[in-house]
Structures are given as structure tokens and as C-alpha cells.
């Protein structure tokens, strides 16, 4: 186990020519904050892909105003170092994402708004307890001046963390078969304590706590055999050759996980999953009370009053699991209001609102119907973001606000002229047409087509269309 | 626990204010948005206004906007609602409550007491 | 505004009874709908979140459902303590709005 720490020097122009403007001004002052992903390996993954070595934030940086006219200088950073914490050994070599945010602090509505203002990438190789390294990234018209290393939490050590030190027991040399852990000669490499009862002809440990059964032998604490007797040497034979199962060597070989917890495999490394009671990485942890705390990211721990009653974590939204500790993809819950893009930034969600939609998740509708008047007796249809108003005869615009011209739309057939008048318009129709909108023909021996012209109406006289 | 405590009610006649407060005990304040809503006599919950956690963004009921202020003093882990231009129809128990966190759901999770206000002459 | 029609207004029922309480929306809310109690005493208290998720020291005996438009609260059992106002929101759209209640009274 150990940490990977990243201290961002400068964030600002890069050198050359197109110098971009500052993210901030007077109207919108921001501050800056970054994500740091790691994962292992060399491998170009897709910035989506799961930040499987861990990621981390860093608190935001200092309000910042443009100076108007000024350059964009260095902007101001957070204070601190990112720290990403890695459960099992540093893989040595690895690739990382650094993105830097803006937050706008502005008085627009849905409170502040975050928004990327440049993202780097790289593949690195590093030892673990190695001096700092220092790097200079460019993302288009931005530079970012950074350094980086890996330590191992004590007692772990090495370019990986995975030998273990102790203190020298004597002041002169370590126990046999122990050499002294450089860089710290002060202390001793610690043998490896297994899980309790592991059998010691058939299992091993990587791992403190861990039993880990050789070929042919399975159980939590290697001690049963898989098939039959001819595969019981410690590296017995194929199971080509004898028809034995041989496990693979998966990361739940054995089960790491005690206390009847199941384990399944992750892409990395295994996970347990612990009965009540228990918990930790192997379900190690037991005779655990509400007392205890064992519920985090603020779950309700009920009942448990003593070691021997089971409690019990009620998770706050957004966090699952025995004891609250899984955080829930909280994108797959949706939250993003109307048909907004949700962004999980590790320490918040961000929805991205489509036209029409505002609000931490979208959940504002600008342009709905309340508040907002037609005139001239229009009414206001709403839908999905956008509201129009449905305009009483005579009158148009977004809000009925303009007078309509009756006869833009050419509304009389038949070559008939129309006029403009207060009640709406009136068509003059062409000989041989007659009706509102001249629409009907006249026949030759002067009947006309339904419907029959009012009694006083001659065809050919200009008609009212109220 | 979280615990929700209103104060401030009391008789105010049309026209007048009256600033409630909530105090907020038990969770980080600083990490939930906070609601306000109220109940006339003999009649159902109204959602009156509510503020983020930062407190950069609040919304209003349509009845109460340009009338009601929502606020809150995050180191002092309270909650404020200005009430001006009092209308009778404005009498009611108000409730503080807490928003889920990240407002992923818009929930109230937890409700104060409510503390009474009566708007008469 | 998105409107919040509750039935029944009321109902009686009996201890060990199933209730069933149904909540309509005039527009899809997407399943952002919760349920609260009320107490006569005034105390109000979230039962269920997102449609269907339990809030925390909620007894199992409630449940909610639906999607779209409808949705329903269920008590599979009413207990003594469960006689009360029951109240559906949603939480899509502002303004938050909630259905005009449901008075569970002993028969």
C-alpha cells in the first residue's frame, strides 16, 4: 500500500504565439481545481475508461478576477498536494490524466458552473520511493507544470511497497533469513504473517492476512484437497496427465475472504463482499457495534448494541454495500432532469441541461408557461422546454405582441384580393369564385357549388371573413 | 441525529415581515440543500423555496417570489427565510427541511417541528 | 407547474389491511417521485425516495412503485402506527410539488 502524490506547480499560457484569454473575468470570476486518474499499465485507455489505480481532487484554488486588458497570467492554485491512496502494490508503471476545472462562481442560475478547461495525459514508468519528477504538459494554448512520486505507507517498502519492515528487534542485525530494508537500515524485512491457520505445507501469502493455496489445494485455509489423492503434492502433477482440477491462479484462489464473505474477482484484484458483522478487505474485521461506527459516508448504523447482534447501515442516497463503503455509479441513477448529460466529477455530479432547462439538474424549465403572459388574449402552450403562444386572430410575434398582417398568408384562392380589416380580412374574389376565400367555383348556369351563397350576396362580391 | 429546529413565527399583520429560523444539528449543514415548506390550516404540504448547499443557487414558489428570501450561514449551521409584504394567505406551519445529498433525488429527508405563522389584522 | 393528483383523499382501514395509495402526475416526472407521512401531531417523515427506494429505519412493510405518470405507495400490513396523511412529491421539475394527501383512518 502507499500513495502517489501529485503537486501542481503552475497552471497558465503556454509559450508561443495565441495566447488564450483567462477563464475568469469581471462578470464570471472563477477558481481553478484539477482531477488527477491513474491507472496501471501502459496501455492508451480511453479517458472514460475506470481510474482503476484510483483518482483524487484537489480543493479549489483561490477566487480569481481578470484584470481587464491584462494577459491571462499563471492562475492561482489550490493549496496541497492530490493524493491518490493504492490499496496493493505500485504496478511501476502506469498512465495518468490530469484535468483542470473551472468553476464560475457567477450569479447565474444553477449556482456555480464547472467546466474543463484543459486535460493531459501520459504514460509514465516509477518506482515506488523514488524523488519527485518533475513533468511540463501542453493541452492546446495552456501549460501545466507538475511533479510526482509514489511512497509506501509504512511498514510497506520497495520500488513496489510490497516487503514489510519492522524495527530492528535487536540493535545489531536482523533475524535469520532477514536482510535490512534500504533505504531505512534501522530496520528489518518482517516475514509475511499469513492468515491465521493457513497450512504452511500447502499455502502462502503475498499479502498479510492472506492464504493463498498452491495447486491442487483449496479452501480458505488451503487445507483441502481438490480432487484425488495422486494431486496432493504441493506441485502435483497436470491435470493433463491425471485428470485433476487444477485451479487457475485467479485473485479469489483460496478465498481471501474470511468470515464466510464471498469474493469476486475485479479487474485489478478480487473484492469481498462481508456477512453482517463483519468488515475490511477480507471481511477481517468483526465483533463490530454501532458503537464501532462501522457505517460510512454518513450511514445510520441501528442495532448492534453489543458484539453478538448484527447492526445494521442504512446508506444515505448515492452509497451501498454491508457498510455504506460502495459509492453508487450515481450516473445510472439518472439525475440529470430532462433530458440533461450527467458528468460524475469523483466530488460532484454536473448535468450538462439541454436549451430550455437550467438548474444543478436540470430541473428548472425556463421556457414553461408560468409567469409568462401571451398578449392580446393569446394562451401559452407549453412543451418540453420551449413554450409558444397560440395568438388570437389579428395579432403574432413569440408573445402575440405584433399586429399580424391577416393577408401575408395569401389567404384568398383563386386570384381573389384580399383586404386587411379590424375583424380579420376580407376576400374580393375573382369572377366565377365566390365564399370566405373565394374557394368555391360558380357554376355556368349561375347555381353554385355547396354551400349556397348568403340570400343578398351576389358572386363576385367581396366577403367578410369574420 | 439530525435534528431541525424552526423559530421565529408568530402573529404579523398584512403588509408586515418576519424572518424564520431554522438550526441545524447532526450532518455536515454544509454538504445539503435546504427546503422550506408550509402548511395552511386544514389543507396539504406547499413547497416554498429552497437553497443549495454553497448556497449559490435558491428557487421560489411562484406565490411567495419577489416576496421571500431563502439564506442560509453555513458556519453558524442555520437557515433563513425573509418574509416580506405578509399576506394572509401566507399563514401556515412552516417546515425546514434538509435535501438529499448532491440533490440527486430532490427529497426532504428530514423535517423540523415547524414553527407557526399567522398573518392577520 | 406539474400537477399532483392523490386518491384516495381519504380511506378507512384496518390493522393488517393492505393499502394501496396511488399518486398521478400531469406530465412524466420520471420516476423522481417520493412519499412522505404525517403525523397528527404534524411531524412529517420521508418513506420513500426515486419511486421504490426505502429511506433509512423505514419499515419494509412500505413500498412504492410506478414510472411515467403513475405511481402507487403500497402498506403490505397497516400497523397502529401507520394511521396518518400521506403525502406523494416530485422532484423532476420546479417547483417541487406534492399531491394533496391521503388521510389513512381507522375503520
Known amino acids: 500500500a502507499g500513495v502517489f502524490e501529485l503537486q501542481i506547480h503552475s497552471f497558465g499560457p503556454g509559450p508561443g504565439p495565441g495566447a488564450p484569454r483567462s477563464p475568469c473575468s469581471a462578470r464570471l470570476p472563477c477558481r481553478l481545481f484539477f482531477r488527477v486518474c491513474l491507472k496501471p499499465g501502459l496501455s492508451e485507455e480511453a479517458a472514460e475508461s475506470p481510474c482503476a489505480l484510483g483518482a483524487a481532487l484537489s480543493a479549489r484554488g483561490p477566487v480569481y478576477t481578470e484584470q481587464p486588458g491584462a494577459p491571462a497570467p499563471d492562475l492561482p492554485l489550490p493549496d496541497g498536494l492530490l493524493q491518490v491512496p493504492f490499496r496493493d502494490a505500485w504496478p511501476g508503471t502506469f498512465s495518468f490524466i490530469i484535468e483542470t476545472w473551472r468553476e464560475e462562481l457567477g450569479d447565474q442560475i444553477g449556482g456555480p458552473a464547472w467546466s474543463l478547461l484543459a486535460r493531459v495525459a501520459g504514460r509514465r514508468r516509477l518506482a515506488a520511493g523514488g524523488p519527485w519528477a518533475r513533468d511540463i504538459q501542453r493541452a492546446g494554448a495552456w501549460e501545466l507544470r507538475f511533479s510526482y512520486r509514489a511512497r509506501c505507507e509504512p511498514p510497506a517498502v520497495g520500488t513496489a511497497c510490497t516487503r514489510l519492515c519492522r524495527p530492528r528487534s535487536a540493535p545489531s542485525r536482523c533475524g535469520p533469513g532477514l536482510r535490512p530494508c534500504a533505504p531505512l537500515e534501522d530496520e528489518c524485512e518482517a516475514p509475511l504473517v499469513c492468515r491465521a491457520g493457513c497450512s504452511p505445507e500447502h499455502g502462502f501469502c503475498e499479502q498479510p492476512g492472506e492464504c493463498r493455496c498452491l495447486e491442487g489445494w483449496t479452501g480458505p485455509l488451503c487445507t483441502v484437497p481438490v480432487s484425488t489423492s495422486s494431486c496432493l503434492s504441493p506441485r502435483g502433477p497436470s491435470s493433463a496427465t491425471t485428470g485433476c482440477l487444477v485451479p487457475g491462479p485467479g485473485p479469489c484462489d483460496g478465498n481471501p475472504c474470511a468470515n464466510g464473505g464471498s469474493c469476486s474477482e475485479t479487474p485489478r484484484s478480487f473484492e469481498c463482499t462481508c456477512p453482517r458483522g463483519f468488515y475490511g478487505l477480507r471481511c477481517e474485521v468483526s465483533g463490530v457495534t454501532c458503537a464501532d461506527g462501522p457505517c460510512f459516508n454518513g450511514g445510520l448504523c441501528v442495532g448492534g448494541a453489543d458484539p453478538d447482534s448484527a447492526y445494521i447501515c442504512h446508506c444515505p442516497p448515492g452509497f451501498q454495500g454491508s457498510n455504506c463503503e460502495k459509492r453508487v455509479d450515481r450516473c445510472s441513477l439518472q439525475p440529470c432532469r430532462n433530458g440533461g448529460l450527467c458528468l460524475d466529477l469523483g466530488h460532484a455530479l454536473r448535468c450538462r441541461c439541454r436549451a430550455g432547462f437550467a438548474g444543478p439538474r436540470c430541473e428548472h424549465d425556463l421556457d414553461d408557461c408560468a409567469g409568462r403572459a401571451c398578449a392580446n388574449g393569446g394562451t401559452c402552450v407549453e412543451g418540453g422546454g420551449a413554450h409558444r403562444c397560440s395568438c388570437a386572430l389579428g395579432f403574432g410575434g413569440r408573445d402575440c405582441r405584433e399586429r399580424a398582417d391577416p393577408c401575408a398568408a395569401r389567404p384568398c384562392a383563386h386570384g381573389g384580393r384580399c383586404y386587411a380589416h379590424f375583424s380579420g380580412l376580407v376576400c374580393a374574389c375573382a369572377p366565377g369564385y365566390m365564399g370566405a376565400r373565394c374557394e368555391f367555383p360558380v357554376h355556368p348556369d349561375g347555381a353554385s357549388a355547396l354551400p349556397a351563397a348568403p340570400p343578398g350576396l351576389r358572386p363576385g362580391d367581396p366577403q367578410r371573413y369574420l | 441525529e439530525v435534528q431541525l429546529v424552526e423559530s421565529g413565527g408568530g402573529l404579523v399583520q398584512p403588509g408586515g415581515s418576519l424572518r424564520l429560523s431554522c438550526a441545524a444539528s447532526?450532518?455536515?449543514?454544509?454538504?445539503?440543500?435546504m427546503h422550506w415548506v408550509r402548511q395552511a390550516p386544514g389543507k396539504g404540504l406547499e413547497w416554498v423555496a429552497y437553497?443549495?448547499?454553497?448556497?449559490?443557487?435558491?428557487y421560489y414558489a411562484d406565490t411567495v417570489k419577489g416576496r421571500f428570501t431563502i439564506s442560509r450561514d453555513n458556519a453558524k449551521n442555520s437557515l433563513y427565510l425573509q418574509m416580506n409584504s405578509l399576506r394572509a394567505e401566507d399563514t401556515a406551519v412552516y417546515y425546514c427541511?434538509?435535501?438529499?445529498?448532491?440533490?440527486?433525488?430532490?427529497?426532504?429527508?428530514?423535517w423540523g417541528q415547524g414553527t407557526t405563522v399567522t398573518v392577520s389584522s | 407547474d406539474i400537477q399532483m393528483t392523490q386518491s384516495p383523499s381519504s380511506l378507512s382501514a384496518s390493522v393488517g389491511d393492505r393499502v394501496t395509495i396511488t399518486c398521478r402526475a400531469s406530465r412524466d416526472i420520471t420516476k423522481f417521485l417520493n412519499w412522505y407521512q404525517q403525523k397528527p401531531g404534524g411531524a412529517v417523515k420521508l418513506l420513500i425516495y426515486?419511486?421504490?427506494r426505502l429511506h433509512s429505519g423505514v419499515p419494509s412493510r412500505f413500498s412504492g412503485s410506478g414510472s411515467g405518470t403513475d405511481y402507487t405507495l403500497t402498506i403490505s400490513s397497516l400497523q397502529p402506527e401507520d394511521f396518518a396523511t400521506y403525502y406523494c412529491q416530485q422532484g423532476n421539475t420546479l417547483p417541487w410539488t406534492f399531491g394533496g394527501g391521503t388521510k389513512v383512518e381507522i375503520k
Open positions: 437553497i443549495s448547499s454553497g448556497g449559490y443557487t435558491s
Open positions: 447532526g450532518f455536515t449543514f454544509s454538504d445539503y440543500g
Open positions: 426515486y419511486t421504490s
Open positions: 427541511a434538509r435535501g438529499d445529498y448532491e440533490d440527486i433525488f430532490y427529497t426532504m429527508d428530514y
